[in-house]
Each structure stands twice: as structure tokens, then as C-alpha cells.
């Protein structure tokens, strides 16, 4: 038994036929010693007398609000809730399995940007006697603060004969660091109580994995002279992180009729405009995704082809500008060739995802992530890799990136990746290895030395352990190169002469 909140207790029960249940001792919160009686819920039947009441809790009939009285006056209450465990598994009767992205997904969370603000939601078919309370933190062993509001009913839907209720909650990390590479996941815990049944649900994620931008805004069409083509332009959504030269998006533009089966024109772009072929009765749609980390696409923003007006809104500030490779010096050393670094780091992002595209969706955290990926270098809040830090002195950040590149380059050349099951040298991992080396050499020319981090001794004996480690290393590499790519894109756009 444990206390959920003041005067509310949860009794954990193994739920099987003829289970002995739990013996619970309730104590009346009063200085009185004599003449105390106990009742359950609305019943006037006296269950026992004395300052303590011992009960055997086996089923829901034994749960409820126990009240101690003296001479018709209520002294205190204790509400007992039951938490069922069947075959070693805690019950999940209150919430509906959303089955996306995998089975046993009860909580789903999304973030519109990297500010540390996110929304979680869940579904239930229960309409009454239902309460939720939500707690969250960054990390679990030494938790950092995340503040969550109250859960509210956000939608009602009819599914066949049943009504389905969606509840949601908004949370905000207290000291968010949008530019940093997350090393500890956000933990979300939802306590659900239906009548006398208690259940708890948890979700663990990095903000980067739950990013889903809002749709692009202000779509504008401009027909091109003497052509079937139309220039479509748009802007970054207001809710997306700034500056856009650092937090860049990529876009997918599509022209399609009302039916999905109709023919279409489709083009991908990093810019905030594109030229497409518009057809009568078709619509132009644009959606957005983080440019350097493959999280979710936004919903589509659409405009009908027939509305081809010549008015043009601003075309957004999304394009990370080019700029030459000669860069102004910064305090503490010379600058890298920002544009070359930008191109190579973007290539690294692509390679990191093609080396293991599903890594971002595999939940390997249960497998004891801490002892492996805690050893890899992360770009942290104080490393100067945020836009302001880069402006002040980019050397701190570049040194950190260089350390990480060398570290991962050594890891990819180690027994973890060279051992069985073997990978061919020109596999995406092989290309990734070569590109890591290439970028690290761009950052640190001959004769200029920064200290490098020691490689941990991760020498797995079994091929399956090696495979698991590869997944984990590639997963954290995806996050690392995304931050590095943002740094170089921003540098190329703002720090180039």
C-alpha cells in the first residue's frame, strides 16, 4: 500500500482466483483513543472499533472511502483504491491502446518546436467517475523539472456504437535548452482513477522524436508567364523555433485533385517557394519537417489552384543562406569553411538516417541505455552551440563538435561496427565513417590540435549485443549530427562574410 495523495491510498493486488489479497491497517487521524467506529462509503454498518482498523483487501468491494467517527462526528477519511496486477502485468483497462506507433501505446505526445513545451493525449471510452493527474521530469535518476497543467477533455468522437473521449495535457520543461542535444529523455507519468480502480501509464521520449511542426502558413500562388507553371510560396509556421537559419525546415509540395487516386505533381525543397504545375480543380499542398532530424511531417496546408492570385506574401526566412567559405575570424581561433561544413553535415544527417532509418522508432531504451550512450559526447547547453553562443565565440562549439566527430568516427571504426555481423566498407555506415572523418578534418586542419575525448571500452562479445549497440550508437549519432548541421547552417547564413 502507498499514498497517492493526502488520505488516498493505493493497494496493489495480485489479481487471480482465490488470491489472498493484502492486509491493510488503517489508522484514524485523531488524538482520540476511545469510542471510535469505522464505516465504508455510504453504509452505516460498523466495520470495527478502535483507533486502527485491519482489513483484508481482495476485491473492489473492499475498496472505497473508510471513515472513522466518534459520537456521530467524522474524524477522518481514508480512500482505498485498487491497482490490479494480472500475470505480473499491471492492468490497463482505463485507457485505450492507440497502437501507434506500436502496440501498447496509451499516451501520445507531440511538440510543435524545441522550446520544451509539449502536449500529450490519451483516449478512453469511460465518461464518468474519472480523474487524471500528470507528472513529468527530464530523466528519472536525477530528475529535472517539467511542469504539467491539468488534464482536460479535449475531444469527443463517436466510434461505431461507442463514444471515445480524448484527454490532453500541456507540459513545459522548466529550464529548456532548445539548441542542445538531449541526452536524458522526458518521462511522463499519468495517474488514472476510475471509480475505485487506479492505473498508471508512462511514456519516455526525447523532444526531438516527438517534433511535429505546424503547417506552413501564408501560402501564395503566382502564375508564371507563358507557362503552365505556378510559383507557390509560403512561410515558416509562427510556432516553429527561431532563428530559422538554425532551426531549419524542409518542405514537400504537392498538387493533387480531390481524390487521392488522381494524378499529382510533387517536389521537395528546403526553400520557401517552389514551381509546380497547377491543374483546374486541384489544390496545392505544402507540409514541413525538421530538415536535419526525421521526426513527423506537419499536416498539409492547402490552397486551391483556381485561387492563383498575383499577390505575394513574404517568402519566410527559412532558407539558410549560402555564403562563401572564407569566414571572419572569431575570438580564440580561425573559423571553418562554414558552407563546406554545412554541406557535409547535411550529408551526414542523410547518411545517419539511411544507415539505420528505423533507429528513431525502435524503443531500445529498456535495454539499459544509460551505460552505453551516457559515454558518448553530447552537445550540451553550456557548449555555446546555440545561435547566441555561436555569435559570441563559435570556437567553443566547434571544438565540442570536433570532439564528437572524432569520437563517433572511432566508434564506427571499432569492433562494434567491424565485427560480426559484418558491414561492407561502402555501406551507408562505411560512407558515414568516411564523412565523419572528412568533416572533422575540415574543422581541424593539420597542425591545429584540440583535445579529444577518450573512447569508452564497449566491446560486446555477442553479435546480437553488437547489433543492439550499433542501433544505439547510430541513434545518438543522428541527434548529434542534427545539432552539428544546425550549427553549420546557421554559421553559413550568418557568420560568413
Amino acid at each position: 500500500i502507498w499514498e497517492l495523495k493526502k488520505d488516498v491510498y493505493v493497494v496493489e493486488l495480485d489479481w487471480y482466483p482465490d488470491a489472498p489479497g493484502e492486509m491493510v491497517v488503517l489508522t484514524c487521524d485523531t488524538p482520540e483513543e476511545d469510542g471510535i467506529t469505522w464505516t465504508l462509503d455510504q453504509s452505516s454498518e460498523v466495520l470495527g472499533s478502535g483507533k486502527t482498523l485491519t482489513i483484508q483487501v481482495k476485491e473492489f468491494g473492499d475498496a472505497g472511502q473508510y471513515t472513522c467517527h466518534k459520537g456521530g462526528e467524522v474524524l477522518s477519511h481514508s480512500l482505498l483504491l485498487l491497482h490490479k496486477k494480472e500475470d505480473g502485468i499491471w492492468s490497463t483497462d482505463i485507457l485505450k491502446d492507440q497502437k501507434e506507433p506500436k502496440n501498447k501505446t496509451f499516451l501520445r505526445c507531440e511538440a510543435k518546436n524545441y522550446s520544451g513545451r509539449f502536449t500529450c493525449w490519451w483516449l478512453t471510452t469511460i465518461s464518468t467517475d474519472l480523474t487524471f493527474s500528470v507528472k513529468s521530469s527530464r530523466g528519472s535518476s536525477d530528475p529535472q523539472g517539467v511542469t504539467c497543467g491539468a488534464a482536460t477533455l479535449s475531444a469527443e468522437r463517436v466510434r461505431g456504437d461507442n463514444k471515445e473521449y480524448e484527454y490532453s495535457v500541456e507540459c513545459q520543461e522548466d529550464s529548456a535548452c532548445p539548441a542542445a542535444e538531449e541526452s536524458l529523455p522526458i518521462e511522463v507519468m499519468v495517474d488514472a482513477v476510475h471509480k475505485l480502480k487506479y492505473e498508471n501509464y508512462t511514456s519516455s521520449f526525447f523532444i526531438r522524436d516527438i517534433i511535429k511542426p505546424d503547417p506552413p502558413k501564408n501560402l501564395q500562388l503566382k502564375p508564371l508567364k507563358n507557362s503552365r507553371q505556378v510559383e507557390v510560396s509560403w512561410e515558416y509556421p509562427d510556432t516553429w523555433s527561431t532563428p530559422h537559419s538554425y532551426f531549419s525546415l524542409t518542405f514537400c509540395v504537392q498538387v493533387q485533385g480531390k481524390s487521392k487516386r488522381e494524378k499529382k505533381d510533387r517536389v521537395a525543397t528546403d526553400k520557401t517557394s517552389a514551381t509546380v504545375i497547377c491543374r483546374k480543380n486541384a489544390s496545392i499542398s505544402v507540409r514541413a519537417q525538421d530538415r536535419y532530424y526525421s521526426s513527423s511531417w506537419s499536416e498539409w496546408a492547402s490552397v486551391p489552384c483556381s485561387g492563383s492570385g498575383s499577390s505575394r506574401g513574404g517568402s519566410g526566412s527559412g532558407g539558410s543562406g549560402g555564403g562563401g567559405s572564407k569566414l571572419r575570424a572569431v575570438p580564440g581561433g580561425s573559423s571553418p569553411a562554414w558552407t563546406q561544413c554545412q554541406q557535409l553535415s547535411q550529408k551526414l544527417c542523410t547518411l545517419a538516417w539511411s544507415a539505420h532509418p528505423l533507429v528513431g522508432h525502435m524503443d531500445l531504451r529498456e535495454e539499459g541505455d544509460e551505460e552505453t550512450t551516457n559515454d558518448v559526447p553530447h552537445i550540451q547547453c553550456g557548449d555555446g552551440c546555440d545561435p547566441q553562443g555561436l555569435r559570441d565565440n563559435s570556437q567553443f562549439c566547434l571544438q565540442r563538435i570536433h570532439q564528437g566527430l572524432i569520437f563517433y568516427e572511432k566508434l564506427l571504426g571499432s569492433d562494434i561496427f567491424t565485427g560480426e555481423p559484418s558491414l561492407l566498407p561502402d555501406s551507408p555506415v562505411g560512407q558515414l565513417h568516411a564523412s565523419l572523418l572528412g568533416l572533422s578534418q575540415l574543422l581541424q586542419p593539420e597542425g591545429h590540435h584540440w583535445e579529444t575525448q577518450q573512447i569508452p571500452s564497449l566491446s560486446p562479445s555477442q553479435p546480437w549485443q553488437r547489433l543492439l549497440l550499433r542501433f544505439k550508437i547510430l541513434r545518438s549519432l543522428q541527434a548529434f549530427v542534427a545539432v552539428a548541421a544546425r550549427v553549420f547552417a546557421h554559421g553559413a547564413a550568418t557568420l560568413s562574410p
Epitope: V255, E262, K263, V267, T269, D270, T275, R279
Partner: antibody
Framework: QVQLVQSGAEVKKPGASVKVSCKAS????????LHWVRQAPGQGLEWMGW????????EYAPKFQGRVTMTTDTSTSTAYMELRSLRSDDTAVYYC???????????WGQGTMVTVSS | EIVMTQSPATLSVSPGERATLSCRAS??????LHWYQQKPGQAPRLLIY???QSISGIPARFSGSGSGTEFTLTISSLQSEDFAVYYC?????????FGGGTKVEIK
């Protein structure tokens, strides 16, 4: 399944015109864009243009503008590509292809060899 | 127009080996890049679209990667039927353009 059958080989004199046909089957003709791509002997592929059979809209590669005309006959599900003022370097295999997507080529015809020779 | 450059022009590989073909664009084309295979006397066949998307019916040994200006087609273990010419094609802007092709021949 979607199929494109092209007309037979042609031999033409320089300055003449050629009209190649492409008969579609296995799908609703107006549901797919139709492109023409050519390939000179031993050379690579060269895109000529597209037509939307639904409305007759066309877009031609600048290189062929003014010399090529693409048309369709929806009653027979047939597309045509006419190339005028033929030169010897127009000798090539001409392919039609169809796709629901405008910018790449999914289903190809078997090709029509056009030889331009005096 | 966007110029597509493929390398190498000819690639000699033994059956069972891995082949890596490169395609470079004269300007950034995001992921608007498609790969085709052409055997002698046949029409080309679409292998990969939008840089990395696989086509149903195409063997899993064919995979694509890249974005921006550099792209790669990888054939993980060459089979006898894979010896052919491979073309990349950009769809970023009209006119649509192809690379000059890479001939994969038996070593």
C-alpha cells in the same frame, strides 16, 4: 496492368516530320500524365515534354519548343508526338511513358526507332 | 537547366559484390532524384524514386540515399541480371534532366 504500345520504326529525310503514336491500356487514359523521352544510339536519355490527356496541357523542354507537338485522342486512348524539321541528330529511339506522378517515369512503352537519313 | 553528372562511367564488379553508383547535381535538388535501370534493347525501368523510396517489385538489394547535390545508388550484392546501365534523373525543376549513365559490367 498498365501497358503502352508504340507505333513501328520510321525512316525520314532531313527536314521532314514524324508522328509517333502510343496506345495506352489497363488504366483510365486521363488519369496519368504522358511523357516523351528519347535516346540517341549509344547515348543517354533526354526528356522532351509531357501532356495531360485530361485537358491537353503540355510542357516542352526548351530544346524542342516550336518543333514538337504532343497531342492525345481520349476516344482511342492514344498519345501522339510529332517532331518537325528533322535533322540527322534526331535519330533516336523515342519512348512514351505514363505515370500518375508528373516528374518521374514509371511505365514505359517499348520505344520507336526513328532514323533521319538523306 | 540542372546538369546531372554520373560517376564512374563504367563500373566493373564481380557477381555477389556490392556496387555503389554516384550522381551529382549542378545545384541543390533536395531529394528530387530518381534512379532507372536499362538493359540492352529494353526500355528503362524505375528502381528508386525521391532519392531513397523503394518501388514494389524491385529487389531489396537496390537502395538509394543522398540529398542536396550528392546521391548514391547501392546494389548490395550484384546478381547476373543487374548488369545494365543505370541513370539518375532530377525532378527539381523543368526541364527534367538525366545523368549520362553508369554502365555496370561483369569484372
Amino acid at each position: 496492368q498498365v501497358q503502352l504500345v508504340q507505333s513501328g520504326a520510321e525512316v525520314k529525310k532531313p527536314g521532314a516530320s514524324v508522328k509517333v503514336s502510343c496506345k495506352a491500356s489497363g488504366y483510365t487514359f486521363t488519369d496519368y500524365y504522358l511523357h516523351w523521352v528519347r535516346q540517341a544510339p549509344g547515348q543517354g536519355l533526354e526528356w522532351m515534354g509531357w501532356i495531360d490527356p485530361e485537358n491537353g496541357d503540355t510542357e516542352y523542354a526548351p530544346k524542342f519548343q516550336g518543333r514538337v507537338t504532343m497531342t492525345t485522342d481520349t476516344s482511342t486512348s492514344t498519345a501522339y508526338m510529332e517532331l518537325r524539321s528533322l535533322r540527322s541528330d534526331d535519330t533516336a529511339v523515342y519512348y512514351c511513358n505514363a505515370n500518375k506522378e508528373l516528374r518521374y517515369f514509371d511505365v514505359w512503352g517499348q520505344g520507336t526507332m526513328v532514323t533521319v537519313s538523306s | 537547366e540542372i546538369v546531372m553528372t554520373q560517376s564512374p562511367a563504367t563500373l566493373s564488379v564481380s557477381p555477389g559484390e556490392r556496387a555503389t553508383l554516384s550522381c551529382r547535381a549542378s545545384q541543390s535538388i533536395s531529394i528530387n532524384l530518381h534512379w532507372y535501370q536499362q538493359k540492352p534493347g529494353q526500355a528503362p525501368r524505375l528502381l528508386i524514386y525521391f532519392a531513397s523510396q523503394s518501388i514494389s517489385g524491385i529487389p531489396a538489394r537496390f537502395s538509394g540515399s543522398g540529398s542536396g547535390t550528392e546521391f548514391t545508388l547501392t546494389i548490395s550484392s550484384l546478381q547476373s541480371e543487374d548488369f545494365a546501365v543505370y541513370y539518375c534523373q532530377q525532378s527539381n525543376s523543368f526541364p527534367l534532366t538525366f545523368g549520362g549513365g553508369t554502365k555496370v559490367e561483369i569484372k
